[in-house]
Interface confidence: medium
């Protein structure tokens, strides 16, 4: 069966949008008006993994690009990166674990926990124009809560 996907944008709980920063990095900043067109549109795929009522495994690709968010160890630290893949083979139902995030719903907000590195989350900084990263703390200075906006295909 083909993997199911939908297009969406994400904003952090401070309403910062995610945009490309160079070829392999995302950053978070406040956008208004026409600048909103800069925000990244994700193709969120619903993949195989541990699932519960509030937790759904997903992969986050960039729409119409062969790039996926993935979690790898760099210098012994879990790190978020944009990884290039062969578009003939992706997305797929059984994504490699580094591409899988547990989309967790809490009080109408979403967290994206790395399946590869439990308790590490897609995060943004309080500061403007900083990279999106994988953070190992929740409820601290860094932001781990997001909202999702559906985008028509």
């Amino acid at each position: 069966a083909p993997v199911r996907s939908l297009n969406c944008t994400l904003r952090d709980s401070q309403q910062k949008s995610l945009v490309m920063s160079g070829p392999y990095e995302l950053k978070a900043l406040h956008l208004q008006g026409q600048d909103m067109e800069q925000q990244v549109v994700f193709s969120m795929s619903f993949v195989q993994g541990e699932e519960s009522n509030d937790k759904i495994p997903v992969a986050l690709g960039l729409k119409e690009k062969n790039l996926y968010l993935s979690c790898v160890l760099k210098d012994d630290k879990p790190t978020l990166q944009l990884e290039s893949v062969d578009p003939k083979n992706y997305p797929k139902k059984k994504m490699e674990k580094r591409f899988v995030f547990n989309k967790i719903e809490i009080n109408n907000k979403l967290e994206f926990e790395s399946a590869q590195f439990p308790n590490w989350y897609i995060s943004t900084s309080q500061a403007e124009n900083m990279p999106v990263f994988l953070g190992g703390t929740k409820g601290g200075q860094d932001i781990t809560d997001f909202t999702m906006q559906f985008v028509s295909s």
């Epitope: 069966a1 199911r4 939908l6 619903f46 699932e51 759904i56």
Partner: nanobody, 123 residues
């Protein structure tokens, strides 16, 4: 052409049991996650349960957990829902859904659904 034909509904007393069946055709049944959704009178669609392709993972709405059991027989291209300890609030039309995928706590996607079978729980 995809076809999903539900059966097994009926009138049952509170605390009773029913077993719903869904006969599938027109697609490679074993390849697809399947599930059940329901629509109570005057209400919207509500997800009830789903089962992964191969049947090794099952998922249930909190409202039916511990009372309902979903299963599948790929050799017969049939999906089942065993419903025990039925309550008045389980009264609904039950639909079988093909390629049912959960996208959030309250949102699901599916490709096809059947005509439905009515379950009425009343004394």
């Amino acid at each position: 052409e995809v076809q999903l034909l539900e059966s097994g509904g009926g009138l049952v007393q509170p605390g009773g049991s029913l077993r719903l069946s869904c006969a599938a055709s027109g697609f490679t049944f074993e390849d697809y996650q399947m599930g059940w959704v329901r629509q109570a009178p005057g209400k919207g669609l509500e997800w009830v349960s789903s089962i992964s392709a191969m049947g090794n993972r099952t998922y249930y709405a909190d409202s039916v957990k511990g009372r309902f059991t979903i299963s599948r027989d790929d050799s017969k291209n049939t999906l089942y829902l065993q419903m025990n300890s039925l309550r008045a609030e389980d009264t609904a039309v039950y639909y079988c859904a093909e390629n049912l995928v959960k996208i959030s706590r309250r949102h699901w996607m599916f490709d096809y659904w059947g005509q439905g079978t009515l379950v009425t729980v009343s004394s």
